[in-house]
């Protein structure tokens, strides 16, 4: 009856059994367990779990829990059973299972491992060698994301100054959920002497568009018309442009933020695919004006991480006045 049911809710359940942990892909850690032995028959089992630092508490009926995490440090999950979804209910004794990162000298692991998704078409990762590493270490970068069936090895290893790096194709797919996922990265050496380093790169962050390409500058009265080609792969609601105009005579430096704009004025070459236009007001036509443009992603599409594209090549219009 109701009273018995109520008693089973307050009664502490036995602990879960056979808690085990495994790694899938590069950074997907999965814990699984079995229901407790001898649980009350009128108990609808729920499992309470949290990570070692009491983070990410979860109460769910599934006998598994996974997390995407760079395996650079030990991570532990504690699991208990209970008869309701009530967080205030005391769960069974918590059982803990931990997973440690791969072995190796921490000083040998690469540092500053970071990746940028260039123009939604390729990802370029870079890192610094660890302190305890031989200078002739041959690095290998492995990567995985949801649209790959298996872990891939990055082939294009390069060196830029102190940094090593590697780039691989990563094209945005039409699947609307593609960018809700992440790329899992691991860097180690061929000889197995250094401790592997891991990183998880959310596809909503670290996006760097290609620079725009200025196609045309023209004057109409005292207005300067600028026409440029947008970077490919982005939808218009996800980008904005910074147009910088420098005037050689007045030494003024004007900056304008611009939404992707249709080329509707007669001064522009119209209906050209993937081009934007902007009118800079009040520009002196009889002086030299130099224009350059860069582009940034919108925070409503991609996380704010201060990554502008490189500047476009400069283009100038007008006459440079003699200093006499």
């Amino acid at each position: 009856d109701y009273k018995d049911d109520d008693e089973s809710r307050t009664e502490t359940q036995p602990p879960v059994t056979n808690l085990s942990v495994s790694v899938e892909n590069l950074c997907t850690v999965i814990w699984t367990w079995n229901p407790p032995e001898g649980a009350s028959s009128n108990c609808s089992l729920w499992y309470f779990s949290h990570f070692g630092d009491k983070q990410d508490k979860k109460i769910a009926p599934e006998t598994r829990r996974s997390i995407e995490v760079p395996l650079n440090e030990r991570i532990c999950l504690q699991v208990g059973s209970q008869c309701s979804t009530n967080e205030s209910e005391k769960p069974s004794i918590l059982v803990e299972k931990c997973i440690s990162p791969p072995e190796g000298d921490p000083e040998s692991a690469v540092t500053e491992l970071q990746c940028i998704w260039h123009n939604l078409s390729y990802m370029k990762c870079s890192w610094l060698p660890g302190r305890n590493t031989s200078p002739d270490t041959n690095y290998t970068l492995y990567y995985w994301h949801r649209s790959l069936e298996k872990i891939h090895q990055c082939e294009n290893i390069f060196r830029e100054g102190q940094y090593f790096g590697c780039s691989f194709d990563l094209t945005k797919v039409k699947d609307s959920s593609f960018e809700q996922h992440s790329v899992q990265i691991m860097v180690k050496d061929n000889a197995g002497k250094i401790k592997p380093s891991f990183n998880i790169v959310p596809l909503t962050s670290r996006v760097k568009p290609d620079p725009p390409h200025i196609k045309n500058l023209s004057f109409h009265n005292d207005d300067l018309y600028v026409q440029w080609e947008n970077p490919q792969n982005f939808i218009s609601r996800c980008l904005f442009y910074e147009v910088e105009v420098n005037n050689s005579q007045t030494e003024t430096h004007n900056v304008f933020y611009v939404q992707e704009a249709k080329c509707e004025n007669p001064e522009f070459e119209r209906n050209v695919e993937n081009t934007s236009c902007f009118m800079v007001p009040g520009v002196l036509p009889d002086t030299l004006n130099t224009v350059r443009i860069r582009v940034k992603t919108n925070k409503l599409c991609y996380e704010d991480d201060k990554l502008w594209s490189n500047w476009s090549q400069e283009m100038s219009i007008g006459k440079k006045r003699n200093s006499t």
């Epitope: 609601r237 904005f240 933020y257 939404q259 919108n298 704010d304």
Partner: antibody, heavy 118, light 104 residues
Framework: EVQLVQSGAEVKKPGESLKISCKGS????????IGWVRQMPGKGLEWMGV????????RYSPSFQGQVTISADKSISTAYLQWSSLKASDTAMYYC???????????WGQGTLVTVSS | EIVLTQSPGTLSLSPGERATLSCRAS???????LAWYQQKPGQAPRLLIY???SRATGIPDRFSGSGSGTDFTLTISRLEPEDFAVYYC?????FGQGTKVEIK
């Protein structure tokens, strides 16, 4: 000239539904986001959410997710904010604003005062 | 979630004086996204500054914005009678709580 014109003031009872509107003119309505902002009596501004009329993609502030629905009809350059069941705490001035990709609100409607009282 | 904290809550000044309003973000933000607004009683807000330092169309040059990272400032070089109002900073989905500039 960029203009956003909002529908008139509304007086409603708790539990009633409501849809207020914001009509844009003087610019390409489908190329800019439209944002909605709440201002409760004597209080500050609260960002509710945005819609991109070009493809009706919406983003809500976590505080307003599930509480309101933002929509748009690009054929008549109009954005909407609606409630299925109003509460007394929804009493506020609601502003729509044009929202470029860099996130500032560069043109505002005059505001719609919504009063919910039994 | 980013929190924007404005200070002071109220600034009492006389016309002709300089006003300095502060907006502090709980974590570093891109200056591209920081805006300032003015709101007078019974009116909709009006955009003053976007991109932390660019004046919006029609805004007098006595208004200027500066800052980067977590600290941003709106400066009104010489207060005019029509400048007494509430000022808000904003970064996408977050507004500061406002600073009221009142006549001393």
């Amino acid at each position: 000239e960029v203009q956003l014109v909002q529908s008139g003031a509304e007086v409603k009872k708790p539990g009633e539904s409501l849809k207020i509107s914001c009509k844009g003119s003087g610019y390409s309505f489908t190329s800019y986001w439209i944002g909605w902002v709440r201002q409760m009596p004597g209080k500050g501004l609260e960002w509710m959410g945005v819609i991109y009329p070009g493809d009706s993609y919406t983003r809500y502030s976590p505080s307003f997710q599930g509480q309101v629905t933002i929509s748009a009809d690009k054929s008549i350059s109009t954005a909407y904010l609606q409630w299925s069941s109003l509460k007394a705490s929804d009493t506020a001035m609601y502003y729509c604003a044009r929202f470029p990709n860099w996130g500032s609100m560069d043109a505002w409607g005059q505001g719609t005062l919504v009063t919910v009282s039994s | 979630e980013i929190v924007l904290t404005q200070s002071p809550g109220t600034l009492s000044l006389s016309p002709g004086e300089r006003a300095t309003l502060s907006c502090r973000a709980s974590q570093s933000i891109s200056s591209s996204y920081l805006a300032w607004y003015q709101q007078k009683p019974g009116q909709a807000p009006r955009l003053l500054i976007y991109g932390a330092s660019s004046r919006a169309t029609g805004i007098p040059d006595r208004f200027s914005g500066s800052g980067s990272g977590t600290d941003f400032t709106l400066t009104i070089s010489r207060l005019e009678p029509e400048d007494f109002a509430v000022y808000y900073c904003q970064q996408y989905e977050t507004f500061g709580q406002g600073t009221k500039v009142e006549i001393k």
